[in-house]
Amino acid sequence: QKSSIEKCSVDIQQSRNKTTERPGLLNCPIYWQQLREKCLLFSHTVNPWNNSLADCSTKESSLLLIRDKDELIHTQNLIRDKAILFWIGLNFSLSEKNWKWINGSFLNSNDLEIRGDAKENSCISISQTSVYSEYCSTEIRWICQKELTPVRNKVYPDS
């Protein structure tokens, strides 16, 4: 039995897979901050995790995915306010009993040192210094991302 949050993540991923490929971003849009090959956008209001997930998709983006500890540190360096928490695209999958990114991959246990419990209705937030497990219903800010790397157009052989 999938939770509503898991269903939401899966639906968004499936709709992404169905969309036709668009040319990739060469530069970050106005208001977005570049961090290596990503563009990041920090919210100025608060929402529970699933609303944050949905709001990023209105910007043709996703909640932040963090590849490794190095990317986490670079992201945290952009956070100016000490006590502010931000949702990222990672939540607890009850069916798989593991932390799952919204792109469907599982958390490598070495990547993030999470403070708090891994349990149902838990989602991950980051601050300037730490990574926390919070109830997904907690209302905090969030970070959206767009990938900067250009997507090559698919070349189809002549029929």
Epitope: I30, Y31, L41, F42, S43, H44, T45, V46, N47, P48, N51, D55, K59, R80, D81, I84, E139, R141, C144
Partner: antibody, heavy 120, light 107 residues
């Protein structure tokens, strides 16, 4: 057109509480975050905090955290700001102000202001 | 807390002349700066966001510039309705702070 209409002036004694309302019209009330900003006589502007009318989630300026409560009633498209344990230096005009974008911190529409006078 | 310092406190200008208002931030705020106009007895009115982007319906005589710690609001040719107090605001941090204001008065 977007309109934010606030409640009338209030006179309060030190130690009392005041609750100011802000009725929104001309747009989807739950679609925009509401902020509260105050202006003491002859002074600049001071941001107090915000409420997401869609969910009721709040975030307050630490300076007011222990004394302010922001709420909303979506059925009547109204936001409220309550400030307790009033002091004379809380005498100010209090404004509700709509956040123009979820991802930027500017205020694109303001209420007309509510004058709160704290005097013994 | 980021302190926004506006200068001058008062600017006396004749109608038709150019007015240049300054706003300095105590730390780098990028371009996350807003300008508002406030007339006596009225609420502030949004003029410019992101340091230089005019809000809908704002006349072209208003322009903003700057990044980092130094910002400028320029009114190219003052009209009678432009005499007011102008405030800058930063949102680089989530504790939004405003400058003390510049009053533009008729010379």
């Amino acid at each position: 057109q977007v309109q934010l209409v606030q409640s009338g002036a209030e006179v309060k004694k030190p130690g009392a509480s005041v609750k100011v309302s802000c009725k929104a019209s001309g747009y989807s009330f739950t679609g925009y975050t509401m902020n509260w900003v105050r202006q003491a006589p002859g002074q600049g502007l001071e941001w107090m905090g915000l409420i997401n009318p869609n969910t009721g989630g709040t975030y307050y300026n630490q300076k007011f955290k222990d004394r302010v409560t922001m709420t909303r009633d979506t059925s009547i498209s109204t936001a409220y700001m309550e400030l307790s344990r009033l002091r004379s230096d809380d005498t100010a005009v209090y404004y509700c102000a709509r956040l123009g974008d979820n991802y930027r911190g500017y205020f694109d529409s303001w209420g007309q202001g509510t004058t709160v006078t704290v005097s013994s | 807390e980021i302190v926004m310092t506006q200068s001058p406190a008062t600017l006396s200008v004749s109608p038709g002349e150019r007015a240049t208002l300054s706003c300095k931030a105590s730390q780098d705020v990028g371009t996350a700066v807003v300008w508002y106009q406030q007339k006596p007895g009225q609420a502030p009115r949004l003029l410019i966001d992101w340091a230089s982007i005019r809000h809908t319906g704002i006349p072209a005589r208003f322009s903003g510039s700057g990044s980092g710690t130094e910002f400028t609001l320029t009114i190219s040719s003052l009209q009678s309705e432009d005499f007011a107090v102008y405030y800058c605001q930063q949102y680089s941090t989530y504790l939004y702070t405003f400058g003390g204001g510049t009053k533009v008065e008729i010379k």
